[in-house]
């Protein structure tokens, strides 16, 4: 969480951002809130990016003002117009690109003052893994698949029964480049699994950590998946 305060001139207002991550090819949100004003005409929101000449986005006098928007963000940005009045300056970023990563500034002017806060935005790819029993294999085998990751993640297997065990000798992980030549499909196979045990396939890079669990018993198979972004720090 980054909290910024305005300086000089008018009173300062508090602006708060939260570091976040964008999943390339999908839509992302750059979070920013501020002390609200009661009338929309006095609120100015400017989003800037370090190293970029033009603006990322500007909202003033109740509408988007995009005449100075940088070309790389053209047609890809929007504020939540209905929530500006309550202090939400968050930016929706469409079709996140790898190059969107960097330091952003959320700069706010209201009738009460000015303020700004920076936000670190990471980009990459992350997806939920699915663990299945591989019935084609000669021995009891589990197959963990996740369609999109970048940068290349690490894959670690764990089990409820053999806590702390190292499964690297009995597992095999491969990374297959997807058609857009950036993200990769992750496939990890775990051999010699035993029944009545819960196995976890953990995939992690510097952006996200995802876990796929599978519990195999004689009568049923239970699955569960979980994904967590790693860098959600507020500012």
């Amino acid at each position: 969480l980054i909290i910024g305060f305005g300086i000089s001139g008018r009173h300062s207002i508090t602006v708060t951002t939260v570091a976040s991550a964008g999943n390339i090819g999908e839509d992302g949100i750059l979070s920013c809130t501020f002390e609200p004003d009661i009338k929309l005409s006095d609120i100015v929101i400017q989003w800037l990016k370090e190293g970029v000449l033009g603006l990322v986005h500007e909202f003033k006098e109740g509408k988007d003002e995009l005449s100075e928007q940088d070309e790389m963000f053209r047609g890809r940005t929007a504020v939540f117009a209905d929530q500006v009045i309550v202090g939400n300056a968050s930016l929706r970023l469409k079709n996140v690109q790898l190059t969107d990563a960097g330091t952003y500034k959320c700069y706010i002017i209201t009738s009460k003052g000015k303020g700004n806060a920076n936000l670190e935005y990471k980009t990459g790819a992350f997806s939920m893994p699915e663990v299945n029993v591989d019935y084609n294999a000669s021995s009891e085998t589990l197959r963990c698949e996740a369609p999109r990751w970048f940068p290349q993640p690490t894959v670690v297997w764990a089990s409820q029964v053999d806590q702390g065990a190292n499964f690297s000798e009995v597992s095999n992980t491969s990374f297959e480049l997807n058609s857009e030549n950036v993200t990769m499909k992750v496939v990890s196979v775990l051999y010699n699994v035993t029944i009545n045990n819960t196995y976890s396939c953990m995939i992690e890079n510097d952006i996200a950590k995802a876990t796929g669990d599978i519990k195999v018993t004689e009568s049923e198979i239970k699955r569960r998946s979980h994904l967590q972004l790693l860098n959600s720090k507020a500012s």
Partner: antibody, heavy 117, light 107 residues
Framework: EVQLQQSGTVLARPGASVKMSCKAS????????MHWVKQRPGQGLEWIGA????????TYNQKFEGKAKLTAVTSDSTAYMDLSSLTNEDSAVYYC??????????WGQGTSVTVSS | ETVMTQSHKIMSTSVGDRVTITCKAS??????VAWYQQKPGQSPKLLIS???YQYTGVPDRFTGSGSGTDFTFTISSLQAEDLAVYYC?????????FGAGTKLELR
Amino acid sequence: EVQLQQSGTVLARPGASVKMSCKASGYTFTSYWMHWVKQRPGQGLEWIGAIYPGKSDTTYNQKFEGKAKLTAVTSDSTAYMDLSSLTNEDSAVYYCTSSVRNAMDYWGQGTSVTVSS
Amino acid sequence: ETVMTQSHKIMSTSVGDRVTITCKASQDVRTAVAWYQQKPGQSPKLLISSASYQYTGVPDRFTGSGSGTDFTFTISSLQAEDLAVYYCHQYYNTPLTFGAGTKLELR
């Protein structure tokens, strides 16, 4: 769940003053504007003013400057409105309303004020 | 002061009708307009904000449009429970102002 609980009906004499309250719950009281709106019997809605409890900032409709005074006590998440020098024209229902997720999206049940000699 | 003019004080309608209420601002208020519903003895209830954004939990039959000075609120198919007074409200300038209200009653 966001709730705004207003104080009860008031009967007052002309020239007197009244103070009504609006207790907020279910959201961060200090982070959002609390507005006050007047509605005369059978009439429309009239904005009186608003207070930002986090900084005790107030903004008034010029028409109500000197008539209404807005305050807030952050420790118990309660906003107050004082109305002074009451006349028959002040007989109305007074609503508190906060802008939390959107424009004036939560409203109290209203406080009815009757000014009569 | 921005005056919000609702041209009809009362509108006679029937269940199933498409109802359109208009509101005209005396000056440009961009899209900073909300619409409220008020039933007798109740507090106003937010239906639409920023001229066209439906508030959480509001039925799809309620829609809003417009920008600048001309705004429209529409009920696509009137239900009996929609009989109420509807107010437009601008929050672009202070003082914040409301329209005089449009009452929907059965024909």
